[in-house]
């Protein structure tokens, strides 16, 4: 079941999925001046069996100005960004991507990929939040959001990470705690 909405945005933070549940789709988007090849896939799909998950289909872009055929996939990490996120300042890795059964790793970039990735998440997907540069976590509460099915509708849980600037934090006495880890999680409301 696809999640109806995007993960929630919260002030001064970005989110990222560490691994993608089977059923997740990634749009094949090309950067300005390029387009999908005529016979190319609209999206990549995370699929798998009990022992292995991987991305089906390949995204391929060609110049809009020519009728060239396919371009080979070559890594361009600087192009690789996720939907509605910015690159993380530090490796926010609460789980090893390869160790999660039923999940795909981050797909490798393709040549002339658009600068933002558009994912379509499924129920059960978890995304992790981190404060942007210049802000820090007020507390090490849960910094993730999970797409849940409640009363027949999908919704994302509210991340409990609060990111404050240095000036703001100084008003509030109390020990500053390190960045969130995935131990305590906001769970779904009681089901119907």
């Amino acid at each position: 079941e696809l999640c109806d909405d995007d993960p929630p945005e919260i002030p001064h933070a970005t989110f990222k999925a560490m691994a993608y549940k089977e059923g997740t789709m990634l749009n094949c988007e090309c950067k300005r001046g390029f387009r999908r090849i005529k016979s190319g896939s609209l999206y990549m799909l995370c699929t798998g069996n009990s022992s292995h998950s991987s991305w089906d289909n390949q995204c391929q872009c060609t110049s809009s100005a020519t009728r060239n055929t396919t371009k080979q996939v070559t890594p361009q990490p600087e192009e690789q960004k996720e939907r509605k996120t910015t690159e993380m300042q530090s490796p926010m890795q609460p789980v090893d991507q390869a160790s999660l059964p039923g999940h795909c790793r981050e797909p490798p970039p393709w040549e002339n990929e658009a600068t933002e990735r558009i994912y379509h998440f499924v129920v059960g997907q978890m995304v992790y939040y981190q404060c942007v540069q210049g802000y820090r976590a007020l507390h090490r509460g849960p910094a993730e959001s999970v797409c849940k099915m409640t009363h027949g509708k999908t919704r994302w849980t509210q991340p409990q990470l609060i990111c404050t600037g240095e000036m703001e934090t100084s008003q509030f006495p109390g020990e500053e705690k390190p960045q969130a880890s995935p131990e305590g999680r906001p769970e779904s409301e009681t089901s119907c």
Epitope: E9, I10, P11, H12, L138, H139, G141, P142, Q158, Q160, I162, T164, G165, E168, T169, Q171, F172, G174, K177, G184, R185, P186, E187, S188, E189, T190
Partner: antibody
């Protein structure tokens, strides 16, 4: 469904102590910030601060720092707001809400009246 | 703290009117703004979050707009149930702050 149920109205004298409660149900109470909000008679809403029930981490608005104390008992899904010495100016309706950003669920409020 | 100022303080209107309430922040809060409705003797109710996102179950006649320092709450066609006090709240800069409220009363 998500519910926050607050303790009943209180009438106190200046100088007395008081502890009011807010019990959550229908969600993982320990893992959501609880926000306390004050509303003095005929006035607007004031953000007092927050508590994270899982470890009782508290943050107070500068206006309320040192005036009140937040606490929580996650084993019974309850947050508390207390005063050690009430003043007449503490007379107000006090709400607990689920945070941390905007408040999607609110308690019904506890009316505290302080009068000699 | 960021100061939130609402205008007008009181607004007289009739059923069916289009009503607009303004909230101004003393500095930019991006889109991190919520709107609440409160009726006498009741707890506030969330209407809008992130400046323009309608909370689940809230009628579509309510809408929010704006970013930075100026925001508006619009009720497209005022209903009898909408006579209440409305508050804005910023949650961009810790600690969060509310506007002083706008009372919508019957003309």
């Amino acid at each position: 469904q998500v519910q926050l149920v607050q303790s009943g109205a209180e009438v106190k004298k200046p100088g007395e102590s008081l502890k009011i409660s807010c019990k959550g149900s229908g969600y993982s109470f320990a893992n959501y910030w609880i926000v306390w909000v004050r509303q003095m008679p005929g006035k607007g809403l004031e953000w007092m601060g927050i508590i994270y029930p899982d470890d009782s981490e508290t943050r107070y608005s500068p206006s309320f720092q040192g005036q009140v104390t937040f606490s929580a008992d996650k084993s019974i899904s309850t947050a508390y707001l207390q005063w050690s010495s009430l003043k007449a100016s503490d007379t107000a309706m006090y709400y607990c809400t689920r945070g941390p950003y905007y408040s999607d669920y609110w308690g019904q409020g506890t009316l505290v009246t302080v009068s000699s | 703290d960021i100061q939130m100022t609402q205008s007008p303080s009181t607004l007289s209107a009739s059923v069916g009117d289009r009503v607009t309430i303004t909230c101004r922040a003393s500095q930019s809060v991006s889109s991190w703004l919520a709107w609440y409705q409160q009726k006498p003797g009741k707890a506030p109710k969330l209407l809008i979050y992130k400046a323009s996102s309608l909370e689940s179950g809230v009628p579509s006649r309510f809408s929010g707009s704006g970013s930075g320092t100026e925001f508006t709450l619009t009720i497209s066609s005022l209903q009898p149930d909408d006579f209440a006090t409305y508050y804005c709240q910023q949650y961009s800069s810790y600690s969060w702050t509310f506007g002083q409220g706008t009372k919508v009363e019957i003309k």
